[in-house]
Interface confidence: low
């Protein structure tokens, strides 16, 4: 404002200067300039007031915005806490549900296992029942046929590869054991292969057990006539030796399984366990 005023002063001085040089100044121009100066002042004042109003409005709005921001922040903070709580609650519920599901799962698995076991057990019983019925009807047929034909193994005998085997739990000398088997329409076991040997071993355990092999009448012979020389043999090393050193009189004329399954010749009067064998009829 001061500057404007100075300008006016300057204009006046200038006018005086012109007056001195050129004579009296034209009156309309001076009035025009004066009018122009007051308009500028008015404009300047208006702008200042407008600026003040704008500043006030902006300050007011800023204050409102700040309050709104604070409110938003508070709301967001509350929302975050609330959301966290909900997430925690859901997580806890999830864990609980997971545990319950695992519990249900394990219960179901156990029930399924039990059912499977029951089913297996039932199948086994059915199979056994069928086997028993078949065996019984077979025994009846054998009984009616006076034992001349046999298409199944007698009760308590074990079937293997078309033969029936009976394993003693008592002991007898070789001759007595052979007699027992004959009374059962069978004979002392004749071992014809490694497979049969293994089968017999599985059922006997490590026990001395008589077999149907003897040389009491000269050469070694199987009781059922199977050829000894060309057949399966499983002697212990250096056996048979017809040893006389036992002090029981005579040599050793009867064969038996030793504790590891291989054969040895021994005194026939020794009491050992024995195995009877009978062939099944071809009709089976």
């Amino acid at each position: 404002m001061t500057k404007d005023y100075q300008d006016f002063q300057h204009l006046d001085n200038d006018n005086d200067h012109h007056q001195l040089r050129r004579g009296p100044p034209p009156t309309p121009r001076l009035l025009q300039r004066l009018c122009s100066g007051s308009r500028l002042l008015l404009l300047s004042s208006s702008l200042s007031i407008l600026l003040l109003v704008v500043v006030c409005v902006i300050t007011s709005q800023n204050s409102q915005l700040r309050e709104d921001l604070l409110a938003l922040r508070q709301n967001f903070s509350n929302l975050t806490v609330s959301t966290e709580d909900q997430v925690k609650a859901l997580s806890t519920q999830g864990s609980s549900v997971g545990r319950k599901m695992k519990l249900v799962e394990s219960k179901l698995e156990k029930q399924q296992k039990d059912l499977t076991e029951d089913h297996s057990s039932l199948l086994l019983h059915v199979k056994q029942l069928v086997s028993d019925v078949r065996s019984l009807s077979c025994q009846m047929a054998a009984f009616r046929g006076n034992g001349s034909e046999r298409t199944c193994c007698p009760i308590n005998w074990v079937e293997y590869e078309g033969s029936c085997y009976w394993f003693s739990s008592s002991v007898r000398p070789w001759t007595e054991a052979d007699k027992y088997c004959q009374l059962e329409n069978a004979h002392l076991v004749v071992v014809t292969s490694r497979d049969e040997q293994n089968f017999l071993q599985r059922h006997m355990g490590p026990l001395n057990t008589w077999i149907g092999l003897t040389d009491q009448n000269g050469p070694w012979k199987w009781v059922d006539g199977t050829d000894y020389e060309t057949g399966f043999q499983n002697w212990r090393p250096e056996q048979p030796d017809n040893w006389y050193g036992h002090g029981l009189g005579g040599g050793e004329d009867c064969a038996h399984f030793t504790t590891d399954g291989r054969w040895n010749d021994d005194v026939c009067r020794r009491p050992y366990r024995w195995v009877c064998e009978t062939k099944l009829d071809k009709a089976n």
Partner: nanobody
Framework: EVQLLESGGGLVQPGGSLRLSCAAS????????MAWVRQAPGKGLEWVSW????????YYADSVKGRFTISRDNSKNTLYLQMNSLRAEDTAVYYC??????????????WGQGTLVTVSS
Amino acid sequence: EVQLLESGGGLVQPGGSLRLSCAASGFTFDGYDMAWVRQAPGKGLEWVSWISGDGLNTYYADSVKGRFTISRDNSKNTLYLQMNSLRAEDTAVYYCAKQYDYESAWRFDYWGQGTLVTVSS
């Protein structure tokens, strides 16, 4: 001279394990079947387990089946008895025994001095 020396006995809690060893000398070890026999305090001898000379065949008393394992290392002339899931009734002196001859599964001509196994909590 035939000698059998057991070791590995001791005090063990029920459910625990022990491994007994029997070092043999003075005879052709792999030519004979071997066995473990035990004697509980105030009781008679009880056969526990048997193994053939080649180690291929083994046999166990019903009371130890599934818990004890007999084995042998013929290159080291040693017999073993691995005892798992031990019970109080397994408390006894354990002897290793050499079979009398290959024809007699349960006859023994030489015994060790025994090793005491005590199962107690």
